[in-house]
């Protein structure tokens, strides 16, 4: 058993049929010695008396808020949550496996630049009685500070018969060094509590590996005289690290016909303009990627040819 | 050439070669799925790899103030990785093809380090480990890990030379 926060405790249980469970001793936080009784949740049934209560925790029915009283007055509370371990593996019932980029990916994170700011998100089908708490650090043995905000519900989607809820959190490295080569990864730890079930999820990454620039901005076309060619120009996204002579991007320019089956013409360039042939009913799209490190491409910025 | 405490490097040449290094490092080890190559430290973990750290002056301001500190650190890393790519980790079984990106990468690391340091002057360099793994798959795993680290190192070096070529070239 360990303390998650004040008066909230997590009991780690090996979860299998007829498992013996864990013996837990609760102590009433009071100077009083006599006349103390214990109850669980809203029930008025007295579970025991005395300053300590010993219970055998085997299932969710044994978890909940234990309260010690004296003469009708509440003295203190202890909330017991369960953390299930099945076949040596901690349960992952609360969050959905996003399966990208690999199986057992529960947390996904992205950064728009090298400032040390990043966003993580996760999915669940649970709509109520759900709380999250997020902690992060750079490295684990001698951790350097990363500050995370509160997790918030950022999207709701309908998937077949189910509703899916996306939660996200923003974190910022306290002493970020955008120009340095990272040698220690960022660690993100999410505590999830659904009713009386506790689970924890972790992710470890380098900012450089989760970089995904915003799409290029101000995408414009300039027709060239007496030609089917156009000059496409764009600018670095506002959210990208500066100076651009140091934090450079490379770009992919694509001409795509109305039909998805039509052949796509692609040009790669380090410049912020390119000359392409604009076909009727086609559209021109541009996306960006770090020039020197192959992290994710941005989403496309697009304009119609006409 | 970057004579320590002296003249500037050939920024544009360094920029071109460092950008080529980035391309080669990624073609030598493209991201295979999402390989879990996390390092698990234990009580004896010592990191002898020269990383470009915050205080090395490789940020835009540090380069403007005095690029020598940064160039020295980059040179140190280039020599370290050049020695690694020439060691039995890469030359032992399983054999690499003679024209593999690793062979070109090895040559380009040497080329860039020579652009940075003239003959006759030696900056301090890190030693590569002496105790080498005996099994081919151990070498294969280390190749992946070394190339992943090299990708990160050359990305920072390429940013330095790109910025230098754009802002510090005579």
């Amino acid at each position: 058993i360990w303390e998650l926060k004040k008066d909230v405790y997590v009991v780690e249980l090996d979860w299998y049929p007829d498992a013996p469970g864990e013996m837990v001793v609760l102590t009433c936080d009071t100077p009083e010695e006599d006349g103390i009784t214990w109850t669980l949740d809203q029930s008025s049934e007295v579970l025991g008396s005395g300053k300590t209560l010993t219970i055998q925790v085997k299932e969710f029915g044994d978890a909940g808020q234990y309260t010690c009283h004296k003469g009708g007055e509440v003295l203190s509370h202890s909330l017991l949550l369960l953390h299930k371990k099945e076949d040596g593996i901690w349960s992952t019932d609360i969050l959905k496996d996003q399966k990208e980029p690999k199986n057992k990916t529960f947390l996904r994170c992205e950064a728009k630049n090298y400032s040390g700011r990043f966003t993580c998100w996760w999915l669940t089908t649970i709509s109520t009685d759900l709380t999250f708490s997020v902690k992060s650090s750079r490295g684990s043995s001698d951790p350097q500070g990363v500050t995370c905000g509160a997790a918030t519900l950022s999207a709701e989607r309908v998937r077949g018969d189910n509703k899916e809820y996306e939660y996200s959190v923003e974190c910022q490295e306290d002493s970020a060094c955008p120009a340095a080569e990272e040698s220690l990864p960022i660690e993100v730890m999410v505590d999830a509590v659904h009713k009386l079930k506790y689970e924890n999820y972790t992710s470890s990454f380098f900012i450089r590996d989760i970089i995904k620039p915003d799409p290029p901005k101000n995408l414009q076309l300039k027709p060239l005289k007496n030609s089917r060619q156009v000059e496409v120009s764009w600018e670095y996204p506002d959210t990208w690290s500066t100076p651009h002579s140091y934090f450079s991007l490379t770009f992919c320019v694509q001409v795509q016909g109305k039909s998805k089956r039509e052949k796509k013409d692609r040009v790669f360039t380090d410049k912020t303009s390119a000359t392409v042939i604009c076909r009727k009913n086609a559209s021109i799209s541009v996306r960006a990627q770090d020039r020197y490190y192959s992290s994710s491409w941005s989403e496309w910025a697009s304009v119609p040819c006409s | 050439r970057a004579v320590p405490g002296g003249s500037s490097p050939a920024w544009t040449q360094c920029q071109q070669l460092s950008q080529k290094l980035c391309t080669l490092a990624w073609s030598a080890h493209p991201l295979v799925g999402h390989m879990d190559l996390r390092e698990e430290g234990d009580e004896e973990t010592t990191n002898d790899v020269p990383h470009i750290q915050c205080g090395d002056g490789c940020d835009p301001q540090g380069l403007r103030d005095n690029s020598q500190f940064c160039l020295q650190r980059i040179h140190q890393g280039l020599i370290f990785y050049e020695k690694l790519l020439g060691s039995d980790i890469f030359t032992g079984e399983p054999s690499l093809l003679p024209d593999s990106p690793v062979a070109q990468l090895h040559a380009s690391l040497l080329g860039l380090s020579q652009l940075l340091q003239p003959e006759g002057h030696h900056w301090e360099t890190q030693q590569i480990p002496s105790l080498s793994p005996s099994q081919p798959w151990q070498r294969l795993l280390l190749r992946f890990k070394i190339l992943r680290s090299l990708q990160a190192f050359v990305a920072v070096a390429a940013r330095v030379f790109a910025h230098g070529a754009a802002t510090l070239s005579p």
Epitope: - | R38, T45, V49, Q135, W137, L141
Partner: antibody, heavy 127, light 108 residues
């Protein structure tokens, strides 16, 4: 802490096959080397083979080549050892073991020395 | 295959005495890829020494390893009651990774 948890004891008939599992909890599974070592009653230790899950490629002791198959499932952090054409002399405790990490420069790699062992699975081959 | 021969097969000593266990290889073990394990009845082996002379995590200082090439030694400077067990050497220089037949250290 990291643990290797093996499947339960098995009783098999000669000529049949047995598949023993080894589940890792905690730590990085993918780039570790998981070996299988057996110990016949009152006898010494015998290395059978091992796998590095990230590559999916196993290597085997010549003695067991063709009879043993070692596999790994990265998604469940589980390694498996299947031994076929069982004979009475295959009666033994079968251990899975994880390699100690060595250092090369700043990079860890698995040595072939085993610092973490499963609890063992007794396989009895008897008609 | 590299054959490892351990001697003696059994060592009868009293607590507090010094134990010296030998492991001889049929050919040179490169880079000192040699390990020592301790095994007690009904338990899995425990790694004591790797790289011939480095103590594994949590192993008491009374255990030390030495040697190179073909001759290796495990020394227990002063036997504690919990040290009475069987000790195996293992080479990981070449596949297959072979073990010695073991030395049993018993109470005299």
């Amino acid at each position: 802490q990291v643990q290797l948890v093996q499947s339960g004891a098995e009783v098999k008939k000669p000529g049949s096959s047995v598949k023993v599992s080894c589940k890792a909890s905690g730590g990085t599974f993918s780039s570790n080397y998981i070996s299988w070592v057996r110990q016949a009653p009152g006898q010494g230790l015998e290395w059978m083979g091992g796998i590095i899950p990230i590559f999916g490629h196993a290597n085997y002791a010549q003695k067991f080549q063709g009879r043993v198959t070692i596999t790994a499932d990265e998604s469940t952090s589980t390694a498996y050892m299947e031994l076929s054409s069982l004979r009475s002399e295959d009666t033994a405790v079968y251990y899975c073991a994880r390699s100690k990490k060595g250092m090369y420069g700043g990079w860890t790699y698995p040595l072939m020395m085993f610092d973490l062992w499963g609890q063992g699975t007794l396989v009895t081959v008897s008609s | 295959d590299i054959v490892l021969t351990q001697s003696p097969a059994t060592l009868s000593l009293s607590p507090g005495e010094r134990a010296t266990l030998s492991c001889r290889a049929s050919q040179s073990v490169s880079s000192n890829y040699l390990a020592w394990y301790q095994q007690k009845p009904g338990q899995a082996p425990r790694l004591l020494i790797y790289y011939a002379s480095r103590r594994a995590t949590g192993v008491p200082a009374r255990f030390s390893g030495s040697g190179s090439g073909t001759d290796f030694t495990l020394t227990i400077s002063s036997l504690e009651p919990e040290d009475f067990a069987t000790y195996y050497c293992q080479q990981t220089s070449n596949t297959p990774f072979t073990f010695g037949q073991g030395t049993k250290v018993e109470i005299k």
